[in-house]
């Protein structure tokens, strides 16, 4: 503790100019005071002034008023500082002395004589209020007041609490009268060193370094840090925890970039064709007769399906076609014959079989020939076997499909992905996206094509368990464990009997 006992001398009266021994001062009593402050004693005794002592210069002769003086010699009130907890009780001895010597340092003069003394014993609480008193004896009267106040930065009823206001990173506070801390606006905590974050800032996912701020921890975003950041590259998905990619309805894949309901969302098939959610592009169009192309967008000639039989020639009309039949045939498609086997109707070595008691016939054609009279060489391209706009070409007994760029396979049914060029360096895994390939990098690499070597590899310590694959570069300053079937957890450490979920972030 630390405080000051203050004594204000106000007036001293010694009208007859007498000393305590009954002698008079010549020419008058040149008066100074000695003050001794000590612990409480029921009976005041001589001995050390345990709480302090002080002397004044000569303040006047015989009777005088003592003026307040804040500096230099003759300071009034007198100050008796102490460096301990104020006990609340005290003993005070005030002695008035006459000196024949030096005004300023009468203590040192020989021949000093006592005029009078008073003793005060009692209790005194710390406070700013002055306690005023007056003491008389037969010859003198002394008016005075006194109090105990705490030194700067000390507080409480015994001046025992040290408190220094501050406004730095070890505290932002002022001091209450009892020495407790009163936090400045925006700060809290025992030492007022914890900022009060923006109202509503998420307790776990956000923090602040100054008041009314909300800084998000990795994986979180938004003004209040209450929105998770989904997996990097997540297209049609959301998250409930950071780096998750839970697909919206109708979407699938690690990045929710595969449209599981392309037919409904985009209606790609034209001219009444049927759309099914399958195939390399996520859909397949099945065309109505008379249409072709990937989206059945190409209308065929009405004669394209070769409707005229028995060598009839087909002629396109506005919404239909007309068959010109060869001799011996009639009907809309020249399907009826007036010929019999006797007319040798079967060409190219076909054998004739009589039907309906010889009134009609049927030809059995040798290989590579077709038609009711074996008049047509087999065209293996008529069934439009080439998908995705591929061109069909007859090659003797077989046929081949010439595919458009970006497709392959015997029927051009396979989509050549952007990943076929192996754009991912250092063993990165390639994912086809609409806007080009995306690489998921192995441990130790990052960048769009896994071309950047990471110096501090979060996967180097092998954080993923149970054979899980570790990826970096998917989340800031972090790694992702892609769990095998039957395991979950941020490090794939928990076995479950559930189907595999999305990767957990560590």
């Amino acid at each position: 503790g630390s405080g000051i006992f203050q004594l204000r001398l106000q007036e001293f009266v010694n009208q007859r100019g007498m000393l305590a021994n009954g002698q008079s001062c010549e020419p008058g009593c040149r008066t100074f005071f000695r003050i001794c402050l000590k612990h409480f004693q029921a009976t005041f005794s001589e001995g050390p002034c345990t709480f302090g002592n002080v002397s004044t210069p000569v303040l006047g002769t015989n009777s005088f008023v003592v003026r307040d003086k804040n500096s230099g010699s003759g300071r009034n009130p007198l100050q008796l500082p102490f460096n301990f907890t104020w006990p609340g009780t005290f003993s005070l001895n005030i002695q008035a002395w006459h000196t024949p010597g030096d005004d300023l340092r009468p203590e040192t003069s020989p021949g000093n004589s006592l005029i009078s003394q008073i003793i005060i014993q009692g209790s005194l609480a710390v406070g700013k209020i002055w306690r005023t008193d007056e003491q008389n004896d037969t010859l003198t009267r002394l008016s005075y007041s006194y109090r105990v106040i705490c030194s700067d930065n000390y507080y409480g009823e015994s001046c025992s609490r040290l408190c220094k206001k501050r406004d730095d990173h070890f505290g932002h506070y002022e001091c209450q009268p009892d020495g407790s801390l009163s936090c400045l606006p925006g700060w809290t905590g025992k030492y007022c060193d914890q900022p009060i974050c923006l109202s509503g800032c998420h307790e776990q996912n956000g923090y602040c370094s100054k008041p009314d701020e909300c800084i998000c921890r990795p994986g979180w975003q938004g003004r209040l840090c209450n929105e998770c950041i989904p997996h990097n590259g997540c297209r049609h998905g959301t998250c409930s925890i950071p780096w998750q990619c839970a697909c919206d309805e109708g979407w699938g894949g690690l990045f929710c970039d595969q449209d599981l309901n392309y037919c409904t969302h985009h209606s790609p098939c034209k001219n009444g064709s049927t759309c099914s959610n399958s195939g390399p592009k996520g859909y397949t169009c099945t065309c109505l007769p008379g249409y072709t192309g990937e989206h059945c967008e190409l209308g065929l000639s009405k004669c394209a399906s070769n409707p005229c039989r028995n060598g009839g020639s087909c002629k396109d009309q506005e919404n239909s076609y007309h068959c010109l039949c060869p001799p011996g045939y009639y009907g809309q498609h020249c399907e009826h014959s007036t010929l019999t086997c006797a007319d040798s109707p079967c060409f190219n070595g076909g054998s004739c079989r009589e039907r309906n008691q010889g009134s009609s016939y049927a030809c059995e054609c040798p290989p590579n020939f077709t038609g009711s009279n074996c008049e047509k060489k087999v065209d293996r391209c008529t069934s439009n076997p080439c998908a995705n706009g591929g061109q069909c070409q007859n090659r003797g007994p077989s046929r081949t499909c010439r595919c458009r760029p970006g497709f392959t396979g015997t029927h051009c049914e396979l989509h050549i992905s952007d990943c076929a060029r192996s754009p991912c360096a250092h063993g990165g895994t390639c994912h086809d996206l609409e806007n080009g390939p995306v690489c998921t990098c192995p441990a130790g690499f990052s960048g769009r094509r896994c071309e950047v070597r990471i110096t501090h590899d979060a996967c180097a310590s092998g954080p993923c368990f149970n054979g899980a694959t570790c990826y970096t570069g998917l989340s800031p300053n972090n790694f992702v464990c892609n769990c095998p079937y039957g395991f979950v957890g941020s490090r794939c450490e928990f076995p479950v009997g559930l189907p595999p979920s999305f990767p957990w972030v560590a």
């Epitope: 700067d152 070890f170 505290g171 060193d193 914890q194 800084i215």
Partner: antibody, heavy 121, light 107 residues
């Protein structure tokens, strides 16, 4: 018992970069009661406060040194760092890390053993 | 820039005697002062914090005070292990400030 263990002696050339570390053991760097400081002592000279960092990443620097150094923290490794992008000969000094305690009104009760950095061409 | 000035730069005292080290700075009494002891080849060690408090491992012969413009470290009866360099330290807003040190040597 809290211990601050610093990385080893470094000898560098002017213009080179450097990052020294201070690993905290026996306690968490993420406690709200502490800041983690760096103090330097040039050969034959007194102590000079460089700056400190809170576990959240908030930093405070000596205004006379601010632009020359960077203090960072990695809570997952319970470690904090002092780094230079371009060293000068005048950076030659012993560098101490210390724990500054809010409860001790900013007094540093635990110190690292020191990292001697020598910068010379 | 806040400055702490320690005096004397070197203090020669005999073992068993009292040593008083001073640290002055503008209105230093309104700040909390700490004192550190450093021996050759060793890291500094906290001996006084919050003006006058001692860490549990520091002997009672070390005491401190701080008022006005001056903080004082007093070692009541010097032991051989007390001879070292002593630094005072205070915080000026968000910046730590050390004095230049006082070397306490055997007389």
């Amino acid at each position: 018992e809290v211990q601050l263990v610093q990385s080893g002696t470094e000898v560098k050339k002017p213009g080179e970069s450097l990052k020294i570390s201070c690993k905290v053991s026996g306690g968490s760097i993420s406690s709200s009661s502490y800041y983690w400081g760096w103090i330097r002592q040039m050969p034959g000279k007194g102590l000079e406060w460089i700056g400190d960092i809170y576990y959240t990443g908030s930093t405070y620097y000596n205004p006379s040194l601010k632009s020359q150094v960077t203090i960072s923290v990695d809570t997952s490794f319970n470690t904090f760092f002092l780094q230079w992008s371009s060293l000068k000969a005048s950076d030659t000094a012993m560098y101490y890390c210390a724990r500054e305690d809010v409860i001790l009104r900013g007094g540093s009760d635990y110190w690292g053993q020191g990292t001697m950095v020598t910068v010379s061409s | 820039e806040y400055v702490l000035t320690q005096s004397p730069a070197t203090l020669s005292v005999s073992p068993g005697e009292r040593a008083t080290l001073s640290c002055s700075g503008q209105r230093l009494g309104d700040k909390y002062a700490s004192w550190y002891q450093q021996k050759p080849g060793q890291s500094p060690r906290l001996v006084i914090y919050e003006d006058s408090k001692r860490p549990s491992d520091i002997p009672a012969r070390f005491s401190g005070s701080n008022s006005g413009d001056e903080a004082t470290l007093t070692i009541s009866s010097l032991q051989s292990e007390d001879f070292a360099v002593y630094y005072c330290q205070a915080w000026d807003r968000d910046t730590g400030v050390f004095g230049q040190g006082t070397r306490l040597e055997i007389k």
